[in-house]
């Protein structure tokens, strides 16, 4: 058993049929010695008396808010949550496996630049009685500070018969060094509580590996005289790290016909302009990637050819 | 020559070679199914790598103030990786494919390190016993780890030379 926060405790249980469970001793936080009784949740049934209460925690029916009273007055509470371990593996019932970029990916994180700011998100089908708490650090043995905000519900989607809820959190490294080569990964830890079930999820990454620039901005076409060619120009996204002479991007320019089956013409360039042939009813799209490190491409910025 | 001891480096030459290094490092080890090599733990095999850290003067302001400190650090890393790529980690079994970019990568590391030969002091690397795994599968894993680490290192070096070529060239 360990303390998650004040008056909230997590009992770690090996979860299999007829498991013996865990013996837990609760102590009433009071100077009083006599006339103390214990109850669980909203029930008025007295579970025991005395300053301590010993219980055998085996299942969710044994978890909940234990309260000690004296003469109708509440003295203190202890909330017991369960963390299930099945076949040596901690349960992951609360969050959905996003399966990208690999199986057992529950947390996904992205950064728009090298400032040390990043966003993580996760999915669940649970809509109520759900709380999240997020902690992060750079490295684990001698951790350096990363400050995370509160997790918030950022999107709701309907998937077949189910509703899916996306939660996200923003974090900022306290003493970020954008130009340095990271040698210690960022660690992100999410505590999830659904009713009386506790689970924790972790992710470990370098900022460089989760970079995904915003799409290029101000995408414009300039027709060239007496030609089917056009000059496409764009700018670095505002959110990208500066100076651009140091934090450089490379770009992919694509000409795509109306039909998805039509052949795509692609040009790669380090410049912020390119000359392409604009076909009727086609569109021109540009996306960006770090020039020197192959992290994710941005989403496409697009304009119609006409 | 780009000398991290006094005179100004050949920024444009260094920029071209460092950008080539980035391309080679990624073609030598593309992201194969997102292998998470950090899960293997950071044992003694790769932990004496000269990382470009915050105080090394490789940020735009540090380069403007005095680029020599950063160039010395980059030089350290280049000779470290050059030694690793020439060691039995890469020359031993399993043999690299004949068209593997590792040979080119090794030569380019050497080329850039010679461009950056520092004045005033000299760095060398020593092969440490723990850097020579006996099993081919260990060697393969170590190659991946070294190449992933090299990708991060040359990315910073390339940014430094690109910025230098754009803003610090005479």
């Amino acid at each position: 058993i360990w303390e998650l926060k004040k008056d909230v405790y997590v009992v770690e249980l090996d979860w299999y049929p007829d498991a013996p469970g865990e013996m837990v001793v609760l102590t009433c936080d009071t100077p009083e010695e006599d006339g103390i009784t214990w109850t669980l949740d909203q029930s008025s049934e007295v579970l025991g008396s005395g300053k301590t209460l010993t219980i055998q925690v085996k299942e969710f029916g044994d978890a909940g808010q234990y309260t000690c009273h004296k003469g109708g007055e509440v003295l203190s509470h202890s909330l017991l949550l369960l963390h299930k371990k099945e076949d040596g593996i901690w349960s992951t019932d609360i969050l959905k496996d996003q399966k990208e970029p690999k199986n057992k990916t529950f947390l996904r994180c992205e950064a728009k630049n090298y400032s040390g700011r990043f966003t993580c998100w996760w999915l669940t089908t649970i809509s109520t009685d759900l709380t999240f708490s997020v902690k992060s650090s750079r490295g684990s043995s001698d951790p350096q500070g990363v400050t995370c905000g509160a997790a918030t519900l950022s999107a709701e989607r309907v998937r077949g018969d189910n509703k899916e809820y996306e939660y996200s959190v923003e974090c900022q490294e306290d003493s970020a060094c954008p130009a340095a080569e990271e040698s210690l990964p960022i660690e992100v830890m999410v505590d999830a509580v659904h009713k009386l079930k506790y689970e924790n999820y972790t992710s470990s990454f370098f900022i460089r590996d989760i970079i995904k620039p915003d799409p290029p901005k101000n995408l414009q076409l300039k027709p060239l005289k007496n030609s089917r060619q056009v000059e496409v120009s764009w700018e670095y996204p505002d959110t990208w790290s500066t100076p651009h002479s140091y934090f450089s991007l490379t770009f992919c320019v694509q000409v795509q016909g109306k039909s998805k089956r039509e052949k795509k013409d692609r040009v790669f360039t380090d410049k912020t302009s390119a000359t392409v042939i604009c076909r009727k009813n086609a569109s021109i799209s540009v996306r960006a990637q770090d020039r020197y490190y192959s992290s994710s491409w941005s989403e496409w910025a697009s304009v119609p050819c006409s | 020559r780009a000398v991290p001891g006094g005179s100004s480096p050949a920024w444009t030459q260094c920029q071209q070679l460092s950008q080539k290094l980035c391309t080679l490092a990624w073609s030598a080890h593309p992201l194969v199914g997102h292998m998470d090599l950090r899960e293997e733990g950071d044992e003694e095999t790769t932990n004496d790598v000269p990382h470009i850290q915050c105080g090394d003067g490789c940020d735009p302001q540090g380069l403007r103030d005095n680029s020599q400190f950063c160039l010395q650090r980059i030089h350290q890393g280049l000779i470290f990786y050059e030694k690793l790529l020439g060691s039995d980690i890469f020359t031993g079994e399993p043999s690299l494919l004949p068209d593997s970019p590792v040979g080119q990568l090794h030569a380019s590391l050497l080329g850039l390190s010679q461009l950056l030969q520092p004045e005033g002091h000299h760095w060398e690397t020593q092969q440490i016993p723990s850097l020579s795994p006996s099993q081919p599968w260990q060697r393969l894993l170590l190659r991946f780890k070294i190449l992933r680490s090299l990708q991060a290192f040359v990315a910073v070096a390339a940014r430094v030379f690109a910025h230098g070529a754009a803003t610090l060239s005479p």
Partner: nanobody, 125 residues
Amino acid sequence: EVQLVESGGGLVQAGGSLRLSCAASGRTISNYGMGWFRQAPGKEREFVAAISARSAMIGYSDSVKGRFTISRDNAKNTVYLQMNSLKPEDTAVYYCAADLNRRVPTARPQEYDGWGQGTQVTVSS
């Protein structure tokens, strides 16, 4: 905080040898780069040699390369500087220093955190 104590200095004739030791206490140095620097009267402190945490990387100033050898024994929390073929221009106070931010140290004295009190080396002609 790391405390460093140098020893082994003294008066020696040109062409002679000395072995300097630097014993660290208060913190294990096995994860940090270590360096030797020297300062002659009226001159700036200058880099002599440095060694990485696991001895994989070693640096020497051009003026001592081939004559001096830096080494370390992490089990003993000690760094050594073997000085051979000493010259009068090697006369200086020799300082040991720890780069507590790096496994692979630099040649920049300002990057080193822990410094010893120094040991005097005098080479007579």
